[in-house]
């Protein structure tokens, strides 16, 4: 066996094995967004957060999940069975796929006003109509999550909350907050805030079932609550995070360009070596 | 029912410091603001700043240099200093259950900036 | 800082009249807005907030409107105990202002 030959064979496992830990991976995503999507009650008690966008995520997971499938199964058998055309097709996808990033990566540096604007608008548009369709409450629970992660409450400052009817108290006491606001820290006792939630909605997969304005938790708005809006903590965590998050695309990225280098170079060369092996027949 | 008492000096020199306690009952320091708004004799309301149940503090920008509120929950009280004070400090000087809208007021303390 | 700018400064109206005082504020403070009354020698009273919302015990001839950055209370059919200043305060943002005053006088 010539050099270029166990060159090509260590390409062709390399490839092999890590496609099938990004198929399993990906399995393994896919089956987490099916969970979600259908016991959503024994999910929210197995990870203890009530408000978890699940509707959302269980979907997004979903279609990752099937997706990094796919293009590891491509890889998986194309590599194995050094089939070109799978080899092309898992070469094609992962192409599409850098090519995907690096074009977000450039409208989110070039447009980044307008993205800021457009989610502004969005987030805005969901406190607005907060609690107001029981059946659509994907974006509510989203905003609750972020609000509850970067401990922060409405879009500007508390104050965007003040108009949501549903969350209104009475008279003097109107100015109410969602329970997501509720900062448990700082007052000395981490269950504040599920006992607040709980007993208020009294079962544990309320977010499973459509929400009734009875079923809305508030706070006042005065008592121990983030008091920094979104849009400053959101800068902030991506300031934070900021190398994390190049650090993480770069990763990828250059993954991305591994596999398709090494695929490239497996389909190239699976001709030269099928030419060879046919001169000694 | 609620209620909120201001008690203060009477009469500072300038320069000196100003110390009002405003005493609450009927509800909790903890789950309400407690803020402070002074009025110049014969003029409007001034906004001053605001305490949160959970100790946290807003001020008016132009006296966060010089004004401090601080509170107490096992007394009830709520305190305001305002420093280096001049004869424009000269006020009533409330203290109102409220952090935002605000609900219910003292009757004021008269605080007079004189030599 | 947000200025509050409040019209008229002064008015001379009858009891049964019907008055409506206004409130600029110099950005959008998305209805974050209380209405006041204070009598001669008396501490302030609140009567609106978040621009609509009635106070506890406050009589159903008040009434609040307003969105973005003009805003206005309404006072149907004037009860001699109407009359004082009042003083509409935004709290949006992070430092709360008052707006200079209505003087409302009997006629």
């Known amino acids: 066996m010539s050099a270029q030959e166990s060159c090509l064979s260590l390409i062709k496992y390399f490839l092999f094995v890590f496609n099938l830990f990004f198929f399993v991976l990906g399995s393994l995503i896919f089956c987490f967004g099916i969970w979600i999507l259908i016991d959503k009650t024994s999910f929210v008690s197995f990870v203890g957060l009530a408000f978890v966008p699940l509707q959302i995520w269980s979907k997004v997971l979903a279609i990752s999940g099937i997706f990094t499938m796919g293009i590891a199964l491509l890889g998986c058998v194309g590599a194995l069975k050094e089939l070109r055309c799978l080899l092309g097709l898992y070469f094609g996808m992962l192409l599409l796929l850098f090519a995907t990033q690096i074009t977000l990566g450039i409208l989110i540096s070039t447009q980044r006003a307008q993205l800021e604007r457009s989610l502004r608008d969005v987030v805005e548009k969901t406190i607005q109509k907060y609690g107001t369709n029981p059946e659509e409450t994907a974006a509510e629970e989203s905003w609750d999550y972020v609000q509850f992660q970067l401990r922060c409450c409405g879009w500007h400052y508390p104050q965007d909350w003040f108009q949501v009817l549903i969350l209104r108290g009475n008279g003097s006491e109107a100015h109410r907050v969602p329970c997501s606001c509720y900062n448990s820290t700082a007052t000395n006792d981490s269950t504040v805030f599920d006992k607040l939630f709980f007993s208020q909605l009294s079962r544990l997969g309320h977010l499973a079932r459509s929400r009734h304005s009875a079923d809305i938790c508030a706070v006042p708005a005065e008592s121990h609550i983030y008091r920094e809006g979104c849009a400053q903590g959101l800068q902030k965590w991506l300031h934070n995070n900021l190398i994390s998050i190049v650090g993480i695309c770069l990763g990828v990225g250059l993954l991305e360009l591994g596999f398709m280098t090494l695929s490239i170079f497996l389909c190239r060369n699976l001709d030269h070596v099928y030419n060879r092996l046919a001169r000694y027949r | 029912q609620v209620q909120v008492k201001e008690s203060g000096p009477g009469l500072v020199a300038p320069s000196q410091s100003l110390s009002i306690t405003c005493t609450v009952s009927g509800f909790s320091l903890t789950t309400s603001g407690v803020s402070w708004v002074r009025q110049p004799p014969g003029k409007g309301l001034e906004w001053l700043g605001v305490?949160?149940?959970?100790?946290?503090?807003n001020y008016h920008s132009a006296l966060k240099s010089r004004l401090s509120i601080k509170k107490d929950h096992s007394k009830s009280q709520v305190f305001l200093k305002l420093n280096s004070l001049q004869t424009d400090d000269t006020a009533t000087y409330y203290c109102a259950k409220g952090g935002y809208s605000l609900a219910h007021w003292g009757q004021g303390t008269l605080v007079t900036v004189s030599a | 800082d947000i200025q509050m700018t409040q019209s008229p400064a002064s008015l001379s109206v009858s009891v049964g009249e019907t008055v409506t005082i206004t409130c600029r504020a110099s950005e959008n403070i998305r209805s974050n807005l209380a209405w006041y009354q204070q009598k001669q020698g008396k501490s302030p009273q609140l009567l609106v907030n978040?621009?609509?919302n009635l106070a506890d015990g406050v009589p159903s001839r008040f009434s609040g409107s307003g969105s973005g950055t003009q805003y206005s209370l309404k006072i149907n059919s004037l009860q001699s105990e109407d009359f004082g200043t009042y003083y509409c305060q935004h709290y949006w943002g992070t430092t709360w202002t008052f707006g200079g005053g209505t003087k409302l006088e009997i006629k």
């Open positions: 978040v621009a609509t």
């Open positions: 305490i949160w149940g959970d100790g946290s503090t």
